[in-house]
């Protein structure tokens, strides 16, 4: 029974040049988290392993950092960097929680914060 | 090549123990989550247990959990299911997998099996 | 536990045929689902996860689809090395969960 939230920090925008947070929370559960994956599409990111720690992607290596926590900072942002980011929860027992951001990396200097979601 | 060698099937009377092993080679074994799947004479396949890259954590579906017990030794590259109070409806070939690292429910790669038979 | 169906079990074509298995999960499992293939006396092989994603090696002819809780395996033109049993794997939640198998037969 799937019974947690993850709350995310929905859609955002952010500065070309500039850096990102991406940030997810799992509530409402008592699931043991045993690794999340940070996506982009298809493509993976980011993973943090209960046992190993954190991998970041090659391809990604100089502009991904990892943290705070759970989350994960996009560097040196680009307009092709525009577009859904999705963290993946892997828990025991409660199974797969996925939550999604929608990032925009904007030219202007006018780069606001959506307003925090949830998604079940 | 990634290499998975499974040992220490055979004929055992209903209530007996057994030790699987499974020797890994090809690979940084102590990087992998790795899991023991089996398959009854002319069925299909059911997942027993899984253990994380440094053992921190095993879970196991309800039909074995108390009876069974994974682990390794990363030092020697080798998986273990301990079996006991085991049963008729355990008998079956016994597969060790490794997990992908990215999403740790697929099993990317697979050993040959080794036999289970309880029997009196 | 989510129960993952398969259909049919078993079918009979011949080469060059396009052949298609689906699987029905009894509740959603996103894009949580692998496919693997089987041949007698073998170990089972990965050839998709995430629904659609092909494993490395495996031959383009092979093709998955579905989210929730369909999801269909397409051989696009049946080789002879192809026959063999066909599984798909849930990993939304636990216990993993395999379907009942689909074996392809030689028509």
């Known amino acids: 029974m799937m019974t947690g939230t993850i709350e995310t920090t929905g859609n955002i925008s952010a500065e070309k040049g500039g850096s990102i947070i991406l940030q997810c929370h799992l509530s409402s559960t008592t699931a043991q988290v045993t690794q999340v994956n940070w996506e982009q599409q298809d493509q993976l990111l980011a993973i943090c392993n209960a046992d190993l720690g954190w991998h970041i992607s090659p391809s990604f290596k100089d502009r991904v950092a990892p943290g705070p926590g759970l989350g994960l900072t996009l560097q040196s942002l680009t307009v092709n960097d525009t577009g859904e980011y999705f963290c993946i929860y892997h828990t025991y027992p409660d199974g797969t929680y996925t939550g999604r951001i929608f990032l925009e990396v904007l030219e202007s200097s006018v780069a606001e914060h959506g307003a925090r979601f949830q998604i079940p | 090549e990634v290499k998975l060698v499974e040992s220490g099937g055979g004929l055992v009377q209903p209530g007996g123990s057994l030790r699987l092993s499974c020797a890994a080679s090809g690979f940084a074994f102590s990087s992998f989550d790795m899991s023991w799947v089996r398959q009854a004479p002319g069925k299909g396949l059911e997942w027993v247990a899984v253990?994380?890259?440094?053992?921190?954590?095993?879970f196991y579906p309800d039909s074995v959990k108390g009876r069974f017990t994974i682990s390794r030794d990363n030092s020697k590259n080798t998986l273990y299911l301990q079996m006991n109070s085991l049963r008729a409806e355990d008998t079956a070939l016994y597969f060790c997998?490794?997990?992908?690292?990215?999403?740790?429910?697929?099993?990317?790669?697979w050993g040959q099996g080794t036999l289970v038979t309880v029997s009196s | 536990d989510i129960q993952m169906t398969q259909s049919p079990s078993s079918l009979s074509a011949s080469v060059g045929d396009r052949v298609t298995i689906t699987c029905h999960a009894s509740?959603?499992?996103?894009?949580?689902l692998s496919w693997y293939q089987q041949k007698p006396g073998k170990a089972p092989k990965l050839l998709i996860y995430?629904?659609?994603t092909l494993a490395s090696g495996v031959p383009s002819r092979f093709s998955g689809s579905g989210s929730g809780t369909d999801f269909t395996l397409t051989i696009s033109s049946l080789q002879p090395d192809d026959f063999a049993t066909y599984y798909c794997q849930q990993g939304q939640s636990y216990p993993w969960t395999f379907g009942g198998g689909t074996k392809v037969e030689i028509k």
């Open positions: 509740q959603n499992i996103n894009v949580w």
């Open positions: 253990i994380s890259s440094g053992g921190s954590y095993t």
């Open positions: 995430k629904a659609s």
């Open positions: 997998t490794r997990q992908d690292y990215r999403y740790p429910y697929i099993m990317d790669y």
